[in-house]
């Protein structure tokens, strides 16, 4: 699929950071998602999972990020093997989780 | 060592400028936010701003009362980090430290790390 | 502009538990952090993220935090905690950093 170039990345970690910097209150009222697998797809993988929080205001704009690296079109209930789907997690964690492994995405140049 | 030295301190009237350095050695200052912090003679602490890493966006922050004359700054490739101070006034007297900034610990990979330098003197007075 | 209030000052004899209090209305979702600053000295960080000890702070350091306040407790207060404490964080953006006014304590010799 399409790999989101410098800026676009640099973005994403920007509002990732917006909506957790100093953050102790839980995210989207404590909602849990599946932990999703780093190692591949992990646009389309926490899509698929942040897809199904919805009335969440704080995670609208790194949904609708995501979806523009995604190359294809995520909906709500859909699952696929990137989901790690024996483990929820609260969203908090899980943006913060995936922060750090876009950092060091950004690290390495694998935009 | 992990460490972190202010410099550029000094005598200046009102109205003046003045650059405020801080060499940062022993960490990866490149991943860390930074933050100025000062204290006025015989007074508490007070947040003066704060610059993220360039990863994280590289946006700067500051206090109500500098905003619009003070300017924070980072050249990573120099690990220094940098105040500039214009239209000085009287109230603006303190001792200057730079500190990483804790809020953004988690994401510099510093959780809980504490990294002060010594503070430099600043004395606004005709 | 946003604010942190801690009382001016605490007095304590040695051994016994010495509490300080910062309260803030955005401390319900934002985290606190404390420092130490002893005479003459930079700050040094006691407790992050309301309840952490960073490593070499010594565990009769702790931290709570419950609604608009954060607690710094000091179990056993020694002389040698004898300093000014602030507490820091940030207004409800988690863009402006704030310190508290503060608060001196005083371990009675």
């Known amino acids: 699929g399409p790999v989101p170039p410098y800026t676009a990345l640099k973005e994403l970690i920007e509002e990732l950071v917006n909506i957790t910097q100093n953050q102790k209150a839980p995210l989207c009222n404590g909602s849990m998602v599946w932990s999703i697998n780093m190692t591949a797809g992990v646009y389309c993988a926490a899509l698929e999972s942040l897809i199904n929080v919805s009335g969440c205001s704080a995670i609208e704009k790194t949904q609708r990020m995501l979806s523009g690296f995604c190359p294809h079109k995520v909906s709500a209930g859909q699952f696929s093997s990137l989901l790690v789907r024996d483990t929820k997690i609260e969203v908090a964690q899980f943006v913060k989780d995936l922060l750090r492994h876009l950092r060091k995405l950004f690290h390495q140049g694998t935009f | 060592e992990v460490q972190l030295v202010e410099s550029g301190g000094g005598l200046v009237k009102p109205g003046g400028s003045l650059r405020l350095s801080c060499a940062a050695s022993g960490f990866t200052f490149s991943n860390a936010w930074m933050s100025w912090v000062r204290q006025a003679p015989g007074k508490g602490l007070e947040w003066v701003g704060r610059?993220?890493?360039?990863?994280?966006?590289?946006?700067?922050n500051y206090a109500a009362p500098v905003k619009g004359r003070f300017t924070i700054s980072r050249d990573d490739s120099k690990n220094t980090l940098y105040l500039q101070m214009n239209s000085l006034k009287t109230e603006d007297t303190a001792v200057y430290y730079c500190?990483?900034?804790?809020?953004?610990?988690?994401?510099?990979?510093?959780?809980?790390?504490?990294?002060w330098g010594q503070g430099t003197t600043v004395t606004v007075s005709s | 502009s946003y604010e942190l209030t801690q009382p001016p000052s605490v007095s304590v004899s040695p051994g016994q538990t010495a509490r300080i209090t910062c309260s803030g209305d955005a401390l319900p979702e934002k985290y606190a952090y404390w420092y130490q600053q002893k005479s003459g000295q930079a700050p040094v960080l006691v407790i992050y993220?309301?309840?952490k000890r960073p490593s070499g702070i010594p565990e009769r350091f702790s931290g709570s935090s419950s609604g608009t306040m954060a607690t710094l407790t000091i179990s056993g207060a020694q002389v040698e905690d004898e300093a000014d404490y602030y507490c820091?964080?940030?207004?409800?953006?988690?863009?402006?950093?704030?310190f508290g006014g503060g608060t001196k304590l005083t371990v009675l010799g």
């Open positions: 610059i993220r890493s360039e990863i994280d966006g590289g946006t700067t």
């Open positions: 993220e309301d309840s």
């Open positions: 820091h964080s940030t207004d409800s953006s988690g863009n402006h950093g704030v």
């Open positions: 500190a990483t900034d804790q809020v953004g610990a988690y994401y510099g990979d510093y959780y809980g790390m504490d990294v």
